[in-house]
């Protein structure tokens, strides 16, 4: 089931997925002056079985000069309404991470791909937020948003990330030393976190991120 909306926008923050659930689609977008090859895939699709997941199809871009145009290839109107953009990719290298059943890693860049990746996320997808350069989070721990299905409608949970002040750059997991175990709102030290997604391993990995207090939901 595709998520209807984009992940929430947080002031002075960007989001990134550590891995992508099966069913996720990534548009094959080319940078200006290039286009998809003839009969090329419109998108890559995360598929697989319980033991292994990978991206089906390959995105390929070719110069559009032969067509005497520099117009960028964009999705058709019916595709457009489902566009999900990750602001982080430009493009990203795969993140070194544990293999998650039913999830694909970040696809490697393809030649002449667009600077912005457009994903079509599915229910259960989790994305992580960090403050942009020059801003710093008020709280520590992963700020995450999950696409959930409620009463037949999809919605993203709201990360309580507050990015403030002209501070040093914050990093994504794996790019700075670990800080603290992931926390949500101040929860009793003897009680369990209320994060119940199959992404718990990713929550552990994202513990290096500086984020905020509501990383686990009230329930």
């Amino acid at each position: 089931e595709l998520c209807d909306d984009d992940p929430p926008e947080i002031p002075h923050a960007t989001f990134k997925a550590m891995a992508y659930k099966e069913g996720t689609m990534l548009n094959c977008e080319c940078k200006r002056g290039f286009r998809r090859i003839k009969s090329g895939s419109l998108y890559m699709l995360c598929t697989g079985n319980s033991s292994h997941s990978s991206w089906d199809n390959q995105c390929q871009c070719t110069s559009s000069a032969t067509r005497n145009t520099t117009k960028q290839v964009t999705p058709q109107p019916e595709e457009q309404k489902e566009r999900k953009t990750t602001e982080m990719q430009s493009p990203m290298q795969p993140v070194d991470q544990a293999s998650l059943p039913g999830h694909c890693r970040e696809p490697p860049p393809w030649e002449n791909e667009a600077t912005e990746r457009i994903y079509h996320f599915v229910v259960g997808q989790m994305v992580y937020y960090q403050c942009v350069q020059g801003y710093r989070a008020l709280h520590r721990g992963p700020a995450e948003s999950v696409c959930k299905m409620t009463h037949g409608k999809t919605r993203w949970t709201q990360p309580q990330l507050i990015c403030t002040g002209e501070m040093e750059t914050s990093q994504f997991p794996g790019e700075e030393k670990p800080q603290a175990s992931p926390e949500g709102r101040p929860e009793s030290e003897t009680s369990c976190l209320v994060t119940t997604t199959d992404f718990q391993i990713q929550t552990e990995m994202a513990a290096t991120m500086e984020t905020s207090i509501f990383t686990t939901e009230y329930q």
Epitope: R136, I162, G165, A180, S181, P186
Partner: antibody, heavy 114, light 111 residues
Framework: EVQLLESGGGLVQPGGSLRLSCAAS????????MHWVRQAPGKGLEWVSV????????YYADSVKGRFTISRDNSKNTLYLQMNSLRAEDTAVYYC???????WGQGTLVTVSS | QSVLTQPPSASGTPGQRVTISCTGS?????????VHWYQQLPGTAPKLLIY???ERPSGVPDRFSGSKSGTSASLAISGLRSEDEADYYC???????????FGGGTKLTVL
Amino acid sequence: EVQLLESGGGLVQPGGSLRLSCAASGFTFSSYGMHWVRQAPGKGLEWVSVISYDGSYKYYADSVKGRFTISRDNSKNTLYLQMNSLRAEDTAVYYCAAGVPDYWGQGTLVTVSS
Amino acid sequence: QSVLTQPPSASGTPGQRVTISCTGSSSNIGAGYDVHWYQQLPGTAPKLLIYSNNERPSGVPDRFSGSKSGTSASLAISGLRSEDEADYYCAAWDISLNGPVFGGGTKLTVL
């Protein structure tokens, strides 16, 4: 259970100083930004100051800038507010709060009067 | 003067639905920051009632709901009860102050 317990309030003369403390328990104190919020008698809530989880940055309301200092000791799970050059208009119940803020202490009364 | 604007008072009879508004600016609510609502019963500390515009902490009845649009937000209380008589405050982060700002508070009276 999350608990925030303020102390250090009392009666002080204008121009005097006080140091408020807030003892936190029931959560990982060192992971959260902390606030001081005050409420003058019969009035609304007024944010005073915030400190990041590691104490690396602090912000203050204009009304207290240069007179109040927020600090924290993560090894003691304690938040502080050093209040100098106190004025009559600083009279209020002072609450310490965690996060959004979503958890609040019960408050400590500061009275500035001659 | 508070940065967020709320009506000073609101009232309703038991069972009724009441709405409290909260208006901000482009540096707080309009900048994309979430709105949170607090309930303060007489003589007690504020308690978080709604977070992230429309989410309820555990223990808060579903009679309480929140919404946000543009530079304003609102709190709705349906099926009003006598124990809802309290002061209600909205709050949001303000990027120009680097701290949360509060509304002036709305005193709710259950007639």
